[in-house]
Interface confidence: medium
């Protein structure tokens, strides 16, 4: 039975040229996290494997940094980075938990961080 919940940074906005941290946190379960995948739509950004470490997709290597923790830092943001991001937690014995973050990259300097929220 899957009892865990994923808390994410929710809907967030950031300035063009800036950076942002995508963060998910799995709670309310004792399952072992074997791997976390970070994906944008159908593209794999990065994986953090419990045993094999972090691996960033080559096409994102210049602008994506691992961490903090199991999160992901996006740098040199462009308007094209606007969209949905998913953290996919593979766990044993529970299975797979998925969190969603929507990032909006703004031209102006009035970008504000959205509130945190939980995905059941």
């Amino acid at each position: 039975m899957m009892t865990g919940t994923i808390e994410t940074t929710g809907n967030i906005s950031a300035e063009k040229g800036g950076s942002i941290i995508l963060q998910c946190h799995l709670s309310s379960t004792t399952a072992q996290v074997t791997q976390v995948n970070w994906e944008q739509q159908d593209q794999l950004l990065a994986i953090c494997n419990a045993d094999l470490g972090w691996h960033i997709s080559p096409s994102f290597k210049d602008r994506v940094a691992p961490g903090p923790g199991l999160g992901l830092t996006l740098q040199s943001l462009t308007v094209n980075d606007t969209g949905e991001y998913f953290c996919i937690y593979h766990t044993y014995p529970d299975g797979t938990y998925t969190g969603r973050i929507f990032l909006e990259v703004l031209e102006s300097s009035v970008a504000e961080h959205g509130a945190r929220f939980q995905i059941p």
Epitope: A50, H90, T96
Partner: nanobody, 120 residues
Framework: EVQLVESGGGLVQPGGSLRLSCAAS????????MGWFRQAPGKEREFVAV??????????TYADSVKGRFTINADNSKNTAYLQMNSLKPEDTAVYYC???????????WGQGTLVTVST
Amino acid sequence: EVQLVESGGGLVQPGGSLRLSCAASGRIFRRNSMGWFRQAPGKEREFVAVITRSGGGEVTTYADSVKGRFTINADNSKNTAYLQMNSLKPEDTAVYYCAMSSVTRGSSDWGQGTLVTVST
């Protein structure tokens, strides 16, 4: 210590197929993950595919550049991982390494690599 030995590399024409094997021996406890990585001449080692415990089974993750062409699987009874590579391209030319989680969580063991050359 775990020993990993890759085999199956060689010279193949574009569009061809190869199947790589990675045999593990030594002090193997419960395995969480086995992965394949590659390093082309003059480039960094990059992630290719990984198979990871999740829920009641295993999940696979692929680099975008090989998705739909490569398949990773593992035979737990033989402590062996495989990488089936189809529709090979010249840019797949590299030394292919396998990695496996070791007894110590957070570390991994690596093989010596097998060379795959895709050329006419």
